[in-house]
């Protein structure tokens, strides 16, 4: 089942998955001035068996001005920097999740991909939070969130993390403070029903990659 909810927003923190559960989809997004090739995949799909997982399909971008040929351009340093600076400063996963069965690693970049990667997570996915530069973490539990299925609805668990604006390099001090409840995330909106068409559409997309499903959104 796909998670049809936004992971919790922690002020002054970013989140990142260290590995992606089978069933996760990654949009084939292209940077400005480029588009997917006409017959190209809509997304990459993490698939696999009990021993090995990998990303199916390849993302390919072509210049918007060019119709038939894919333009192979090496990303400029500032583009590489833009992607790099959005990453968390240091990995902080308690286990090497990428080595877990049923998980895919971060896929390598493709030519002219967009600067932000758009994932569609599945139930059981875990993401890890870290304070952005200039903030330090106060927490009383795991700085992680898991997408769970409860009574037919998906929801993300709340990470126990507060990022305070003190300019210190220590990321995870041993201090405890009461967890602030996140603003703008009312309880009534923390989960939504997953429609019965989810798996059908996901399966069809995995098979063909060509169907236009913008109007049959499964989330």
């Amino acid at each position: 089942e796909l998670c049809d909810d936004d992971p919790p927003e922690i002020p002054h923190a970013t989140f990142k998955a260290m590995a992606y559960k089978e069933g996760t989809m990654l949009n084939c997004e292209c940077k400005r001035g480029f588009r997917r090739i006409k017959s190209g995949s809509l997304y990459m799909l993490c698939t696999g068996n009990s021993s090995h997982s990998s990303w199916d399909n390849q993302c390919q971008c072509t210049s918007s001005a060019t119709r038939n040929t894919t333009k192979q351009v090496t990303p400029q340093p500032e583009e590489q920097k833009e992607r790099k600076t959005t990453e968390m400063q240091s990995p902080m996963q308690p286990v090497d999740q990428a080595s877990l069965p049923g998980h895919c690693r971060e896929p390598p970049p493709w030519e002219n991909e967009a600067t932000e990667r758009i994932y569609h997570f599945v139930v059981g996915q875990m993401v890890y939070y870290q304070c952005v530069q200039g903030y330090r973490a106060l927490h009383r539990g795991p700085a992680e969130s898991v997408c769970k299925m409860t009574h037919g609805k998906t929801r993300w668990t709340q990470p126990q993390l507060i990022c305070t604006g003190e300019m210190e390099t220590s990321q995870f001090p041993g201090e405890e403070k009461p967890q602030a409840s996140p603003e703008g995330r009312p309880e009534s909106e923390t989960s939504c029903l997953v429609t019965t068409t989810d798996f059908q559409i996901q399966t069809e997309m995995a098979a063909t990659m060509e169907t236009s499903i913008f109007t049959t959104e499964y989330q």
């Epitope: 049809d4 997304y43 932000e116 993401v127 959104e217 989330q219």
Partner: nanobody, 130 residues
């Protein structure tokens, strides 16, 4: 790759209500995008009205419309809505729907600056008369 078409604009008396819709189409997934509304009055710059995250968990509004306007989305219909209540003459403008991409690498899921939006609709006129 994403086409956005606004509808629902028109004329309304001050204090009245109007509901704008923005339908998305294209070979992609609607829930990939956060959605926002902007407006531009004659002779003025385009300004942020409000935005909603990919799954509708988070919303943000500009101060002039807080408590009067509400943004919602229906991912099954690939549509985002702007419910305008208690309208004022200063709400008169062309209203634009726009889409932005978001990944967790950025710590604000709702974007408020027009430069952060990648896809735009053509706009729909709203006129509020006193």
């Amino acid at each position: 790759e994403v086409q956005l078409v606004e509808s629902g604009g028109g004329s309304v008396q001050a204090g009245g209500s109007l509901r704008l819709s923005c339908e998305a189409s294209g070979r992609t997934l609607f829930s990939s995008y956060g959605m926002g509304w902007f407006r531009q009055a004659p002779g003025k710059e385009r300004e942020f009205v409000g935005a909603i995250s990919r799954f509708g968990t988070y919303t943000s509004y500009a101060d002039p419309v807080k408590d009067r306007f509400t943004i919602s989305r229906d991912n099954a219909k690939s549509t985002v809505y702007l419910q305008m209540n208690n309208t004022k003459p200063e709400d008169t403008a062309v209203y634009y729907c726009a889409a932005y991409t978001y990944s967790g690498s950025f710590y604000s899921t709702v974007k408020t600056h027009h430069d952060e939006y990648r896809y735009w609709g053509q706009g729909t006129q709203v006129t509020v008369s006193s």
